[in-house]
């Protein structure tokens, strides 16, 4: 056969689907690799061919589209399972070709099992809700295209093993789940089960997502530098180790980049010759507010180092702040004999 543009195994599209549920999988060629869509390709006389390699096998084989009740079918650029079985797990390839053109890509499909509380190896999307922010909603994801708009499915929402009913502040509203006022206790995994009829059969779609309650933008403030501050003076003798922590609190801000850095005499530590090390640690509160600590360390400080300006800087989407550390050289204690002599007025 003639050469085919092989895009290899697209591991970025690690598709996971639940056992015994419908799954519709679009050929990734048209979404990520080619500059034209399926309709254009079809109009140009190109044919889409599907085949697969079973898990732990090397042999590529055609997909059996003649199974009872059309369990596996193809519609335009979509491969349908109605429903999936555990042994459908494998690498699937879609190939677009005619006599003069060929392009193909493979992708892994994993059929996973869930337990009665919807626990599974499925990677869960995370939806962040602002704490005490008023009504916020999550929507049952990835159910488009499974049934026509004329079909009215039933949707049941669960938190873990439990149907969401009579909750204080969470109300199921069809495809949406409304949080009247999100609290820390609302953190967790939420599952929607969509049930719909098709050709005399009943199918279920299960979708689980993780809700994480985070700090509200209403409460967000610019970075707060807790250390260095005006109350602590770093007083050292030459030869001692100088350790100055810069501790900064950042309110949670969606998609904000939090930065902390030191300057020494107005320059970044990398741009000066002194032997300085910076160690950073990060901790988060339950609402994902962040505390960053950068410890500036000079193993053997010189009298010259003790005259420098050490400034901690912090920046987030809410603003930029800076604070200088109070560093000074320790005055050596006067020698005992001299002190006595001076005390008696000796010359």
């Amino acid at each position: 056969s003639e050469r085919c543009d092989d895009w290899g195994l697209d591991t970025m599209r690690q598709i996971q689907v639940f056992e015994d549920e419908p799954a519709r999988i679009k050929c990734p060629l048209f979404e990520h690799f080619l500059k034209f869509n399926y309709s254009t390709a079809h109009s140009a006389g190109l044919t889409l061919i599907w085949y697969w390699t079973r898990q732990d096998r090397d042999l590529e084989e055609p997909i059996n589209f003649r199974l009872p009740e059309n369990r596996i079918s193809k519609e335009k650029d979509v491969l349908w399972f109605r429903p999936t079985l555990l042994n459908d797990t494998g690498n699937y390839t879609c190939m677009l070709r005619n006599t003069t053109y060929c392009s193909k890509v493979a992708f892994p499909l994993e059929v996973v099992q869930k337990d009665s509380c919807f626990n599974s190896p499925m990677k869960l999307p995370v939806h962040k809700l602002y704490i005490e922010y008023g009504i916020q909603r999550i929507t049952c994801p990835n159910v488009d295209g499974y049934f026509p708009s004329s079909v009215k499915p039933t949707i049941t929402w669960y938190m873990g093993c439990y149907k969401i009913q009579n909750f204080n502040n969470v109300i199921p509203e069809g495809m949406n789940l409304s949080f009247l006022i999100a609290l820390i206790s609302n953190n967790g995994n939420y599952t929607c089960v969509v049930t719909y009829p098709e050709n005399g059969r009943t199918f279920h779609l299960t979708r689980t997502l993780t809700v994480k309650v985070v700090g509200s933008p209403k409460n967000a403030v610019p970075p707060v530098i807790h250390s260095p501050n005006d109350h602590v003076v770093y007083e050292k003798e030459p030869g001692e180790e100088l350790l100055i922590p810069c501790t900064v609190y950042f309110s949670f801000l969606m998609d904000s980049r939090n930065e902390v850095w030191w300057t020494i005499d107005g320059k970044k530590p990398d741009d000066i010759t002194i032997d300085v090390t910076i160690n950073e640690s990060i901790s988060h509160s339950r609402t994902e507010d962040e505390t960053r600590t950068q410890i500036l360390s000079i193993k053997k400080v010189t009298s010259e180092d003790l005259k420098r300006s050490y400034v901690c800087h912090a920046r987030s989407a809410k603003g930029e702040v800076a604070k200088a550390a109070k560093v000074k050289q320790k005055v050596p204690a006067p020698r005992y004999t001299v002190e006595l002599a001076c005390g008696f007025g000796a010359t």
């Epitope: 509380c117 439990y162 502040n169």
Partner: antibody
């Protein structure tokens, strides 16, 4: 170690109500459900309903709808089961039980209270 | 609701012998089945969940098997402390339901 401690035995007249308490010791890391199960003398176990104290969610078995009310006081880590319009066949030991989390499939009854005997007699 | 039927109602076994208890569901419950042990005057204790997974601290002589509608609890070598009533429970569908129990007594 989480423990569930229930209130003491009760003797009630037919037509009256009883309220059994179940206090949890050990603060949970995340939401959990308290289940109520009863057992008539010499009989099997019968699930009555549950409550999720931190979220307020609850549900009751069809058989007890309209007669049972399960509530919780988060501040004292105590759940309550109230059964009204008592009749002699409600004579039973009433148990509360719980799991560690809302997500533990098959382990929603892994910690049990000691049981509360409710006798309904005229 | 799903009806759970246990058999036999009473099982007479000598210490050291094997005991096999059955539980049947009126419809498939997949592997969503638990077993509990209850001794006189005590609360039930979780033995097995997921049809075959032993709960924390349960001795290896207790094992569970089955899926769908037919389940078995096996006690490989009965100890004196194992004489009790055993209940199965399905948690596949609400309401969660228990079997009527099997009493394991000393022969």
């Amino acid at each position: 170690q989480v423990q569930l401690v229930q209130s003491g035995a009760e003797v009630k007249k037919p037509g009256s109500s009883v309220k059994v308490s179940c206090k949890a010791s050990g603060s949970p890391a995340e939401p959990y459900a308290i289940q109520w199960v009863r057992q008539a003398p010499g009989q099997g176990l019968e699930w009555m309903g549950y409550i999720i104290p931190s979220l307020g969610g609850y549900d009751y078995a069809q058989k007890f709808q309209g007669r049972v009310t399960i509530t919780a006081d988060e501040s004292t880590s105590t759940a309550y089961m109230e059964l009204s319009s008592l009749r002699s066949e409600d004579t039973a030991v009433y148990y509360c039980a719980r799991g560690q989390t809302l997500y533990a499939s098959g382990r929603q009854f892994d910690i049990w209270g000691q049981g509360t005997l409710v006798t309904v007699s005229s | 609701e799903i009806v759970m039927t246990q058999s036999p109602a009473t099982l007479s076994v000598s210490p050291g012998e094997r005991a096999t208890l059955s539980c049947r569901a009126s419809q498939s419950v997949s592997s969503n089945l638990a077993w509990y042990q209850q001794k006189p005057g005590q609360a039930p204790r979780l033995l097995i969940y997921g049809a075959s997974t032993r709960a924390t601290g349960i001795p290896a002589r207790f094992s569970g098997s089955g899926s769908g509608t037919e389940f078995t609890l096996t006690i490989s070598s009965l100890q004196s402390e194992d004489f009790a009533v055993y209940y199965c429970q399905q948690y596949n569908n609400w309401p969660w339901t228990f079997g009527q129990g099997t009493k394991v007594e000393i022969k």
